[in-house]
Every structure is written in structure tokens, then in C-alpha cells.
């Protein structure tokens, strides 16, 4: 069964700056990735970035840089200042659409005991929804 993993890291240099990394563990090719915060996309979450393998990347503040790391993983850096900046217990969700298999979404947040610059290893987060 395909799985999605989510890793959230706080940057040591900027304590309110976050890096989110997400990956898809499955055989299908990725057709779309949506990163949101505050809950799953479409269920109260707010979209931070959308990545399409052919048409490119769109991102919304406070997202600063979204990019493909591999064909099945992405990373997103969040700006740390301003009213819309994330806090330590913010939940981030990644939804991977794999055509024609379907969609898989998982969420994660900063590990409770993590020091700045450290993070938990990228283990698969619980799959919240598979369309």
C-alpha cells in the first residue's frame, strides 16, 4: 500500500522558520502534490504550495520556496515572520496524487521535544485519507 511521509524541522538559524519535507512511498508516478497547514487540504487546511510535475509550482505566503527533491518527494521552506507565521504545534499536511492510483495524504508537526535544527527521521505519518 502506498504511504506518505512528512517531516517537519525548525531551522536553527531562524527559530520561526520551518522546513517541511514530504515523500511518497509507492510505485505510481506523481501527478500533483498539495501542501497545506492547519489540517488536511479541503478540510479546514490552508494551501501553502501546489506542485505539478509539468506545469510547475505555485506557492502562497508564508511559503518561501517549494521544490521537488526527487520525482516522489518535495520540500517547502516557510518564512518565519509576520502574523501568518507557523508556530511549534502547527500541523502540516501533504497530499500526493498518483495517476491513476488515487490520492494519499498524511500530516505531521514538529516533534514535541525537538531542538532547533533537529528533527525526527522521515517516518511515514498516519495516512489520513486515500481517495
Amino acid at each position: 500500500t502506498p504511504e506518505v511521509w512528512v517531516q517537519v524541522r525548525m531551522e536553527a538559524t531562524e527559530l520561526s522558520s520551518f522546513t517541511i519535507r514530504c515523500g511518497f512511498l509507492g510505485s505510481g508516478s506523481i501527478s500533483l502534490v498539495t501542501v497545506s497547514w492547519g489540517g488536511p487540504n479541503g478540510a479546514g487546511g490552508t494551501t501553502l504550495a501546489v506542485l505539478h510535475p509539468e506545469r510547475g509550482i505555485r506557492q502562497w505566503a508564508p511559503a518561501r520556496q517549494a521544490r521537488w527533491e526527487t520525482q516522489s518527494s518535495i520540500s517547502l521552506i516557510l518564512e518565519g515572520s509576520g502574523a501568518s507565521s507557523p508556530c511549534a504545534n502547527t500541523t502540516f499536511c501533504c497530499k500526493f496524487a498518483s495517476f491513476p492510483e488515487g490520492s494519499w495524504e498524511a500530516c505531521g508537526s514538529l516533534p514535541p521535544s525537538s531542538d532547533p535544527g533537529l528533527s525526527a527521521p522521515p517516518t511515514p505519518a498516519p495516512i489520513l485519507r486515500a481517495d
Epitope: S31, R55, W60, P100
Partner: antibody
């Protein structure tokens, strides 16, 4: 109600310039890609240009270097600056919304551009 | 560039007929395809998105199917208001491209 209203069309001589505008209302403009699509008289639809929410731009090969798409999110406005116009650019130009990358869903009523001497 | 070949270019049908229009992509586009209806002097209106999902407010007699390179728009029972021109659009990669259109006329 979601609405797109184009303006700025008209008659222009070959080699001339024209600036089209599109006023958007009824939705959060900055969240959407915006496109220009044209239709020559009696012909089919042809995509012209796309601008992403942060200003990323994409063009049809035949207009690249002549047309410039831009947006002003604070004014809910989309623009198309058309330079070095040719007879082949004569068409109705539509402003179209897209929730990236899910395809165009809302269209304006169109504005007519005629390039003729 | 991805070419979208739409057929037929025109067809004559009667009210109540089942009508099928096809679009073939020159390379795979997954399900990144929409179908649009255009009436004379009017802007196009989206009927189907993601190849097979019905746009809100569109009658259920319209349906879409297909993925990859072969796509179909079906009108199960043609109504008087359905006489129009229909276009497919691929939005998988730039430049976005439309099919050539299918004009549905009254027999």
C-alpha cells in the same frame, strides 16, 4: 458572483500596440492562475498566456516576445500588453480563471481586437 | 507541444439522440483534460473537468471518460439547448492546447 470583465479591445494597425485589461470580482484573485485565450473569427479557441499567483508567466510561442501578461493582485486586475500586432492576432480575447492546475473554469465575455490597415 | 485531435469536426443529430465526441492527445496527459461548450457569440462554459468530473450546475446528461491519450464526451439524450460547439482542452503542460472543436447541429 464570480465575474471577469475584459476591456481595451479595438481596431489597431499592423505593428501597433494595445493593452487589454480584465477586472475580476467575487473571488480571491491572488489565489488563482489567470489566462488569456483568443478566438479568431469563425475559428477555434487558442490559449495565449498564463500568469501564476506570484507572477510566473507562460506564453504561446507565436506571441512570445510581443505580448506581456501581468497582474495587479491589489486591484484584482489582469493585463495583456500586445505589441507588434499582426493581422493574425485579430480575435476575441477572453480572460479566464484557473485554480491551478485544475483547468480553466470561469470565462469573461471577451473583448474584440482587430488588426487591420 | 501536445496536439489535441478532436472528432468529428461536426455532426447532425436529433433531440433525444446519444452523442459522442472524442479527443485524442498526441502524448499522455493523465486526466488533465476539460470539456467546454460554446454557443455563438458567447464565452465557453466548462462542462467536465479532470476528464470525468461534472462541473457544478451542468446537467447529468453530460459525461466524460478516458485517461492518458483517449477521451470522450457523451451527451446521453440531446436537448434543444445542447446544439453548440464543443472543445476539449489539455492543461497538462505548456502550451495549453484545445481540440479543433465539434459543431453539433440539428438534423
Amino acid at each position: 458572483e464570480v465575474q471577469l470583465v475584459e476591456s481595451g479591445g479595438g481596431l489597431v494597425q499592423p505593428g501597433g500596440s494595445l493593452r487589454l485589461s480584465c477586472a475580476a470580482s467575487g473571488f480571491t484573485f491572488r489565489n488563482y492562475d489567470m489566462h488569456w485565450v483568443r478566438q479568431a473569427p469563425g475559428k477555434g479557441l487558442e490559449w495565449v498566456s498564463d500568469i501564476g499567483n506570484s507572477g510566473e508567466t507562460y506564453y504561446l510561442g507565436s506571441v512570445k516576445g510581443r505580448f506581456t501578461i501581468s497582474r495587479e493582485n491589489a486591484k484584482n486586475s489582469l493585463y495583456l500588453q500586445m505589441n507588434s500586432l499582426r493581422a493574425g492576432d485579430t480575435a476575441v480575447y477572453y480572460c479566464v480563471r484557473e485554480e491551478f492546475p485544475l483547468g480553466m473554469d470561469v470565462w469573461g465575455q471577451g473583448t474584440t481586437v482587430t488588426v487591420s490597415s | 507541444d501536445i496536439q489535441m485531435t478532436q472528432s468529428p469536426s461536426s455532426l447532425s443529430a436529433s433531440v433525444g439522440d446519444r452523442v459522442t465526441i472524442t479527443c485524442r492527445a498526441s502524448q499522455g496527459i493523465r486526466n488533465d483534460l476539460g470539456w467546454y461548450q460554446q454557443k455563438p457569440g458567447k464565452a465557453p462554459k466548462r462542462l467536465i473537468y479532470a476528464a470525468s468530473s461534472l462541473q457544478s450546475g451542468v446537467p447529468s446528461r453530460f459525461s466524460g471518460s478516458g485517461s492518458g491519450t483517449e477521451f470522450t464526451l457523451t451527451i446521453s439524450s440531446l436537448q434543444p439547448e445542447d446544439f453548440a460547439t464543443y472543445y476539449c482542452l489539455q492543461h497538462n503542460s505548456y502550451p495549453l492546447t484545445f481540440g479543433g472543436g465539434t459543431k453539433v447541429e440539428i438534423k
